[in-house]
């Protein structure tokens, strides 16, 4: 697990609520699921569903789970160790240059052109020319132009917070 | 407290280097500790963190699986090996100790620069 | 990750001034943030932590206040060795910077 990890937040300040575990640190670190008090002696427990730490650690607070957008399905939930998995839903994509939000893939190829791989969580579809091989610059087509397609089963998780 | 960097140097983008910290003056294998760094005329950049014995370490996205943290408590020092070394990674590289009951750094080495260029 | 954001970059101030130097943290960090002063060539040196506690042998003149997002580092009466770059670090999530203010001789 990276460190600095992306969609981050702090949970919001709290103090040890009687609910939350503590034990002492480890060569002065805490093991993932927790983090450290302020003094430094005692390593306390994430709160379920609500934040994380996912490595060994001086945090003074867990991280704050990331909550899903509209338009996104959870693929599995926020844990005290992992961050929730979000994914775009099916029919949409995220690219790496525009990670805030999924988009809607296109439904078929510009006339001349054969689809050469499917929609996914993570990409649109893909064409190619017929003659030449090479990829299409991703313009939508006209709807009579197009050769149709369905989109692609979801495969894996396109956006990994965490 | 001491802490005195060595290991820098110019190094081709791509290759490796090792810095260590020679640490006195304290109970060093009672400390974590941690490696931060500063570009020419930047910030301040952490960069490593080790604990006391050695067991558990962790790094930001911009250096982990290509930088390691280790330790010898036998003799006092600290290293950062540093593979597939980029330009973005020329700066000045300090050793700093992690003060008690602060959870922040309280101590640093006057630092080695590590030139990556071809 | 969090932001640090430090203002001014560079000020020109006379011995026996007071300096203010601000920091705003892009989310709460509670009151986990440092203080350190650099002169060039020399590694930086811890002034404050926990936003406004006095490190050992820190002169009085140095004062650090606030919580949450926003930080002060306060310089009572300037004084000869005193102009540097100072720095503030937040330590609630990993370890982040702000981008120094260098405090010059007016």
């Known amino acids: 697990e990276s460190a600095l990890i992306t969609q981050q937040d702090l949970a919001p300040q709290q103090r040890a609520a009687p609910q939350q575990k503590r034990s002492s640190p480890s060569e002065g670190l805490c093991p993932p699921g927790h983090h450290i008090s302020e003094d430094g002696r005692d390593c306390i427990s994430c709160k379920y569903g609500q934040d994380y730490s996912t490595h060994w650690n001086d945090l003074l607070f867990c991280l704050r789970c990331t909550r899903c957008d509209s338009g996104e399905v959870e693929l599995s939930p926020c844990t005290t160790t992992r961050n929730t998995v979000c994914q775009c839903e099916e029919g949409t994509f995220r690219e790496e240059d525009s990670p805030e939000m999924c988009r809607k893939c296109r439904t078929g190829c510009p006339r001349g052109m054969v689809k050469v791989g499917d929609c996914t969580p993570w990409s649109d579809i893909e064409c190619v020319h017929k003659e030449s091989g090479t990829k299409h610059s991703g313009e939508v087509p006209a709807v009579e132009e197009t050769v149709t397609s369905s989109p692609g089963t979801p495969a894996s998780p396109c956006s990994l917070s965490g | 407290v001491q802490l005195v960097e060595s290991g820098g140097g110019l190094v081709q983008p791509g290759g490796s280097l090792r810095l260590s910290c020679a640490a006195s003056g304290f109970t060093f294998s009672s400390y974590v500790m941690s490696w931060v760094r500063q570009a020419p005329g930047k910030g301040l950049e952490w960069v490593a963190t080790i604990s006391s014995g050695g067991s558990y370490t962790y790094y930001p996205d911009s250096v982990k699986g290509r930088f390691t943290i280790s330790r010898d408590n036998a003799k006092n020092t600290l290293y950062l090996q540093m593979n597939s070394l980029r330009a973005e990674d020329t700066a000045v590289y300090y050793c700093?100790?992690?003060?008690?009951?602060?959870?922040?750094?309280?101590?640093w080495g006057q630092g080695t620069l590590v030139t990556v260029s071809s | 990750d969090i932001q640090m954001t430090q203002s001014p970059s560079s000020l020109s101030a006379s011995v026996g001034d007071r300096v203010t130097i601000t920091c705003k943290a892009s989310q709460d960090v509670g009151t986990a943030v440092a203080w350190y002063q650099q002169k060039p060539g020399k590694a930086p040196k811890l002034l404050i932590y926990w936003a406004s506690t006095r490190h050992t042998g820190v002169p009085s003149r140095f004062s650090g206040s606030g919580s949450g997002t926003d930080f002060t580092l306060t310089i009572s009466s300037l004084q000869p060795e005193d102009f540097a770059t100072y720095y503030c670090?937040?330590?609630?999530?990993?370890?982040?910077f702000g981008q120094g203010t260098k405090v010059e001789i007016k």
């Open positions: 700093a100790r992690r003060g008690d009951s602060m959870i922040t750094t309280d101590y």
């Open positions: 670090q937040q330590y609630s999530s990993y370890r982040t």
